[in-house]
């Protein structure tokens, strides 16, 4: 295949820590065109698998708010509107990139940090391990 | 009380794009430790609302690969293992940071972006609009 | 321009509700979360509770009780609080202002024009 | 809770004077503090954001500091403008806790 060469315009990469050292313009674009289906806001209390919204907030990491979900119940909730426990809630978790502030209390220096989160709750079928 | 000013060890801020564009050390820092529950790889299949994980590569973001979920039905699964319609499967969307290379093709310079992934689905009542 | 535009002025009896509205323009509505504070007359600022418009997350000041509900309808970008139940000590200069949940350093920078609510019998 | 107890309640002060407000948090905070000036009638404004940073627009007069327990607001010449009420609120705990307010009056 073609390869590219680097830009000529990139900045200068002179740094000893380059390349694990990056510069990073925090002018976010947002790709959220409105091709995307639109999110409901709503599907927290919707859901056969409800769950609450718990406010995570960090001002030393970006993003600093992070709401994140805890299903409400073990179990599902039934065409009758009562709890199955023949069927379980479980969270839909998620790996994110946040930038935490390094060191403490810079406003112009991060490194890049993994976090898992829980986005919503959805029901699923149990395993049953059986005893022999 | 003794004032602490803000942190003497922060990079310089001379920068014209001050504080817009910030350094950022890309070794991870991975705060998912075995405290948290384990993540399951099958609730894709087990779930009343099922789904599909598909691929997505872009060599100019950072990360290269995120994996993003399709419903695989309008309806959810019931009991009896077939599509119910009366309910509906809806994707679990959250926005999320990714690095995108900018200018292109540049190993050290990024720029901040928001980007709406389905990282899963949940089986929610419709909502039913009456007409009059 | 960013603002945050509040209903009018309300008068209402004890044990009934009150619905102030805050509408924003100017900026991305999901992007910032919208906090409500009040402040009785001759008092200070109290925190009343947060709404995420896009998460449809809330959290409340236990103060409250369960009779304060935060909502927010995206489509016209209009938050809304709703305090129920009404005293007399609920009366007060009600505010909007929104909160950049990216970089929670920017804090509460622009804030709505007050609604008074005053609560007689 | 987190209480914030600002000091002093009340101030009387002259143009061209230095004057510092305090804020304590009831226990140490790995927060940030903001500060907000609110003349009668008017919503309250931002000053300092993030304990040290000054907000848009805000005079250079203004400035910021603490960490822990104890921050400070600081204007180091007052200005006929700035005759106001002062808050601060303690950022990253819940709930967002303001101070009681000082009242910052002309001598």
């Known amino acids: 295949g073609i390869t590219i060469p680097r830009n000529p315009g990139c900045p200068n990469s002179e740094d000893k820590n380059f390349p694990r050292t990056v510069m990073v313009n925090l002018n976010i674009h947002n790709r959220n065109t409105n091709t995307n289906p639109k999110r409901s806001s709503d599907y927290y209390n919707r859901s056969t698998s409800p769950w609450n919204l718990h406010r995570n907030e960090d001002p030393e990491r970006y993003p600093s708010v992070i709401w994140e979900a805890k299903c409400r119940h073990l179990g599902c909730i039934n065409a009758d509107g009562n709890v199955d426990y023949h069927m379980n809630s479980v969270p839909i978790q998620q790996e994110i990139l946040v930038l935490r502030r390094e060191p403490p209390h810079c406003p112009n220096s991060f490194r890049l940090e993994k976090i898992l989160v829980s986005v919503g709750c959805t029901c699923v079928t149990p395993i049953v391990h059986h005893v022999a | 009380g003794i004032t602490i000013p803000r942190n003497p060890g922060c990079p310089n801020s001379e920068d014209k794009n001050f504080p817009r564009t910030v350094m950022v050390n890309l070794n991870i820092h991975n705060r998912n430790t075995n405290t948290n529950p384990k993540r399951s790889s099958d609730y894709y299949n087990r779930s009343t609302s099922p789904w599909n994980l598909h691929r997505n590569e872009d060599p100019e973001r950072y990360p290269s690969v995120i994996w993003e979920a399709k419903c695989r039905h309008l309806g959810c699964i019931n009991a009896d293992g077939n599509v119910d319609y009366h309910m509906n499967s809806v994707p679990i969307q959250q926005e999320i940071l990714v690095l995108r290379r900018e200018p292109p093709h540049c190993p050290n310079s990024f720029r901040l972006e928001k980007i709406l992934v389905s990282v899963g689905c949940t089986c929610v009542t419709p909502i039913v609009h009456h007409v009059a | 321009e960013v603002q945050l535009v509040q209903s009018g002025a309300e008068v209402k009896k004890p044990g009934s509700s009150v619905k102030v509205s805050c509408k924003a323009s100017?900026?991305?509505?999901?992007?910032?979360?919208i906090h409500w504070v009040r402040q009785a007359p001759g008092q200070g600022l109290e925190w009343i509770g947060v709404?995420?418009?896009?998460?449809?997350?809330?959290l409340y000041n236990q103060k409250f009780d369960g009779r304060v509900t935060l909502t927010a309808d995206e489509s016209t970008s209009t938050a809304y609080m709703e305090l129920s139940s009404l005293r007399s000590e609920d009366t007060a200069v009600y505010y909007c202002?929104?909160?950049?949940?990216?970089?929670?350093?920017?804090?509460?920078?622009?804030w709505g024009q007050g609604t008074t609510v005053t609560v007689s019998s | 809770d987190i209480q914030m107890t600002q000091s002093p309640s009340s101030l009387s002060a002259s143009v061209g004077d230095r004057v510092t407000i305090t804020c304590s948090a009831s226990?140490?905070?790995?927060?940030?503090i903001d500060w907000f000036q609110q003349k009668p009638g008017k919503s309250p404004k931002r000053l300092i954001y993030?304990?040290?940073d000054l907000a848009s627009g805000v005079p250079s007069r203004f400035s910021g500091s603490g960490s822990g327990t104890d921050y400070t607001l600081t204007i180091s010449s007052l200005q006929p403008e700035d005759f106001a009420t002062y808050y601060c609120?303690?950022?990253?705990?819940?709930?967002?806790?303001f101070g009681q307010g000082t009242k910052l009056e002309i001598k």
């Open positions: 202002t929104r909160y950049d949940k990216w970089y929670s350093f920017e804090g509460m920078d622009i």
């Open positions: 100017g900026y991305t509505f999901t992007d910032y979360e």
């Open positions: 709404n995420d418009p896009d998460s449809g997350g809330t």
């Open positions: 226990q140490g905070i790995r927060s940030y």
């Open positions: 993030a304990t040290f």
């Open positions: 609120r303690q950022v990253g705990n819940y709930p967002g806790t």
